[in-house]
Interface confidence: low
């Protein structure tokens, strides 16, 4: 997991060059990634779908390395929730930025646990026609 921080930082810097004026949204992060437990705990199955979700506008090689690492940490038969993130919304940009910022700081890395947790609350779920959940 140690590699996750520098890899995420690289993606973050690249994303920030493209998108200015988009604030980090801790609320989005908590809605999407945390369990009901306190303090927030995360596992790779909860996080993986979000890295898959930001794949489209990320460097192919770097994002795939991150996904590969998270895949290794996943319990073999643990279900992975597919998520739907609205295309073309300010919240979506904020969401991507938040994911990258949190991992760049290493704040989420220490919260990763090997023990499965309940499915995260999917705060950004959208099933509207014509909106692609991995399309940013």
């Amino acid at each position: 997991m140690l590699e996750l921080q520098p890899l995420s930082r690289g993606l973050l810097e690249d994303y920030q060059k493209k998108e200015t004026g988009v604030p980090e949204s801790n609320r989005t992060l908590l809605l999407c990634l945390t369990s009901d437990s306190q303090p927030p705990r995360l596992n790779s199955s909860a996080i993986l779908p979000y890295f898959r979700a930001i794949r489209p506008l990320s460097d192919k090689n770097i994002i795939d390395k991150i996904i590969e690492q998270l895949d290794k940490l996943k319990f073999q038969h643990e279900p992975e929730t597919e998520i739907s993130v609205p295309a073309d919304t300010f919240e979506c940009k904020s969401f991507i930025l938040t994911i990258l910022q949190q991992f760049s700081k290493g704040e989420l890395n220490s919260k990763l646990e090997g023990k499965p947790i309940p499915n995260p609350l999917l705060g950004l779920d959208s099933t509207r026609t014509g909106h692609h959940h991995h399309h940013h």
């Epitope: 794949r55 506008l57 739907s84 991995h134």
Partner: antibody, heavy 118, light 111 residues
Framework: EVQLVESGGDLVKPGGSLKLSCAAS????????MSWVRQTPDKRLEWVAT????????YYPDNIKGRFTISRDNAKNTLYLQMSSLKSEDTAMYYC???????????WGQGTSVTVSS | DILLTQSPASLAVSLGQRAIISCKAS??????????MHWYQQKPGQQPKLLIY???NLEAGVPTRFSGSGSRTDFTLNIHPVEEEDAATYFC?????????FGGGTKLEIK
């Protein structure tokens, strides 16, 4: 090496049905979104359908919606396209396509030919 | 739907010269600073092959003589220097919104 092999194309009468299959190999099929794209006799390319990596989400253009169904069997590494209420304008070469991050189609199969004619 | 207009419909370029193909979208296809426009090459009797993804990224294994540029509504595929094997039809495609749409194609002939 990424390989996508389509099958099931045939000559069918208007109003008929057909099921296309695409056998995928050389990559982790369950990690990728997949699409069907067709090429009409006048060589125009048309997007037909997309399915997410786990199969939870499907997308279609309006002229296809309700007539075609895209599905996948990740255990068998196979993509499907069930076509019904076929029209003459559905005559085309149908390509199975791998998606990268859903916004890019990076590998295309050789295609399977569908002809709708009475 | 987003309409993609490619020009020219066909062009003939001398070996070693530059080929420029344009793709204009009826509305912006950029998102988060990235143009969601892709370029494909199709040779007779073959399936399309991805050349450039997200406006300017060269797909692995594609020769560096191919390059893409542009943003919002105007995108360009450049081939320089043109080689014999580049004779093909080139398509642009947007994935900014559903339905995904393709340009009508540009047929490149090598003189």
């Amino acid at each position: 090496e990424v390989q996508l092999v389509e099958s099931g194309g045939d000559l069918v009468k208007p109003g008929g049905s057909l099921k296309l299959s695409c056998a995928a190999s050389g990559f982790s099929f369950s990690n990728y979104g997949m699409s069907w794209v067709r090429q009409t006799p006048d060589k125009r390319l048309e997007w037909v359908a997309t399915i997410s990596y786990g199969g939870s989400y499907t997308y279609y253009p309006d002229n296809i919606k309700g007539r075609f169904t895209i599905s996948r069997d990740n255990a068998k590494n196979t993509l499907y396209l069930q076509m019904s209420s076929l029209k003459s304008e559905d005559t085309a070469m149908y390509y199975c396509v791998r998606g990268y991050g859903y916004d890019t189609m990076d590998y295309w199969g050789q295609g399977t030919s569908v002809t709708v004619s009475s | 739907d987003i309409l993609l207009t490619q020009s020219p419909a066909s062009l003939a370029v001398s070996l070693g010269q530059r080929a420029i193909i344009s793709c204009k979208a009826s509305q912006s296809v950029s998102f988060a600073g990235t143009g969601l426009m892709h370029w494909y090459q199709q040779k007779p009797g073959q399936q399309p092959k991805l050349l450039i993804y997200r406006a300017s990224n060269l797909e692995a294994g594609v020769p560096t003589r191919f390059s893409g540029s542009g943003s919002r509504t105007d995108f360009t595929l450049n081939i320089h220097p043109v080689e014999e094997e580049d004779a093909a039809t080139y398509f642009c495609q947007q994935s900014r919104e559903y339905p995904w749409t393709f340009g009508g194609g540009t047929k490149l002939e090598i003189k």
